[in-house]
Interface confidence: medium
């Protein structure tokens, strides 16, 4: 599962700044449906001491709540540990710091293991350009195209952005 995604080069600091969620995928569809635990949207990211800090937007009762999470570095350069609805092994699958980022998480919660992938972009007007890449990474990790949800503006808490 991890074999194709190796050794990021360059600094994590390049990932800092604003991002927009474009698509989600999971082998457990409930996780990314409205009200699902992983139906969350990236707002911004920063890096410090090799760890990734993210501000995410979580839809709550018609509003969007901003929550800060930290993914902690591990001995593997593209792998991070994240505690969110259980334990997550978070992998940076493919990154162009100026354009797009594809990550996936192996989530373990109450003895249940799930796979969730997330595509985010810097510029929403270019989101179509990165969907093929997301589809191909998803297929590599065992997620099918019909398990991908492409988000609309209404979905991704656009109104909650500063």
């Amino acid at each position: 599962q991890e074999g194709n995604h190796e050794e990021p080069q360059g600094g994590l600091e390049e990932l800092s700044g604003r991002w927009h969620s474009v698509a989600l995928a999971s082998n457990k569809s409930d996780l990314i449906k409205p009200w699902g635990h992983f139906r969350v949207f990236i707002h911004s990211m920063s890096a410090k001491d090799g760890n990734l800090h993210g501000d995410i937007l979580i839809p709550q009762d018609g509003q969007c709540e901003k929550v800060s999470l930290t993914a902690f570095k591990t001995a593997t350069s593209n792998k991070f540990d994240l505690e969110y609805w259980g334990h997550n092994d978070l992998y940076l699958a493919e990154v162009d710091p100026k354009s797009y980022l594809i990550l996936y998480m192996i989530n373990q919660y109450n003895d249940d293991t799930s796979l969730v992938a997330h595509l985010m972009v810097r510029d929403l007007s270019r989101q179509q350009d990165f969907l093929p890449a997301f589809e191909s990474v998803c297929e590599d990790i065992g997620l099918h195209k019909d398990q991908i949800v492409v988000l609309s503006d209404d979905d991704r808490c656009q109104g909650s952005r500063d």
Partner: nanobody
Framework: QVQLVESGGGLVQPGESLRLSCAAS????????MGWYRQAPGEQREHVAT???????GYADSVKGRFTIYRDNAKNTVYLQMNSLKPEDTAVYSC??????????????WGQGTQVTVSS
């Protein structure tokens, strides 16, 4: 750095087929994903299709069901089989390769491009 050489472009009539090839040489061990972009005159570049080293594929909506991308790792070549071609498929098609994650635009390798013209 990876060197890419494309072939297979040409002039065809609507409804016909073409197969583009892109052969990679150089630091091919580092390739994670390969694919094709296209650009028509006066238009933005469009990501047409992509395939990972693990065989995962992705397509632009405009070509789904008509184009197929596949990769022959033994020959270090990626192919784009284009069926049911339409005049709007007319463009210069460029092959690209990106290294194993993390991919960075500055590290993309590009071919020189091959012209595909669909006209009656």
């Amino acid at each position: 750095q990876v060197q890419l050489v494309e072939s297979g472009g040409g002039l065809v009539q609507p409804g016909e087929s073409l197969r583009l090839s892109c052969a990679a040489s150089g630091s091919i061990f580092s390739i994670y994903r390969m694919g094709w972009y296209r650009q028509a005159p006066g238009e933005q570049r469009e990501h047409v299709a992509t395939v990972t080293s693990g065989g995962g594929t992705g397509y632009a909506d405009s070509v789904k069901g008509r184009f197929t991308i596949y990769r022959d790792n033994a020959k270090n070549t990626v192919y784009l089989q284009m069926n049911s071609l339409k005049p709007e498929d007319t463009a210069v098609y460029s092959c690209y390769a990106i290294p194993k994650s993390w991919s960075r635009t500055s590290e993309y390798s590009w071919g020189q491009g091959t012209q595909v013209t669909v006209s009656s």
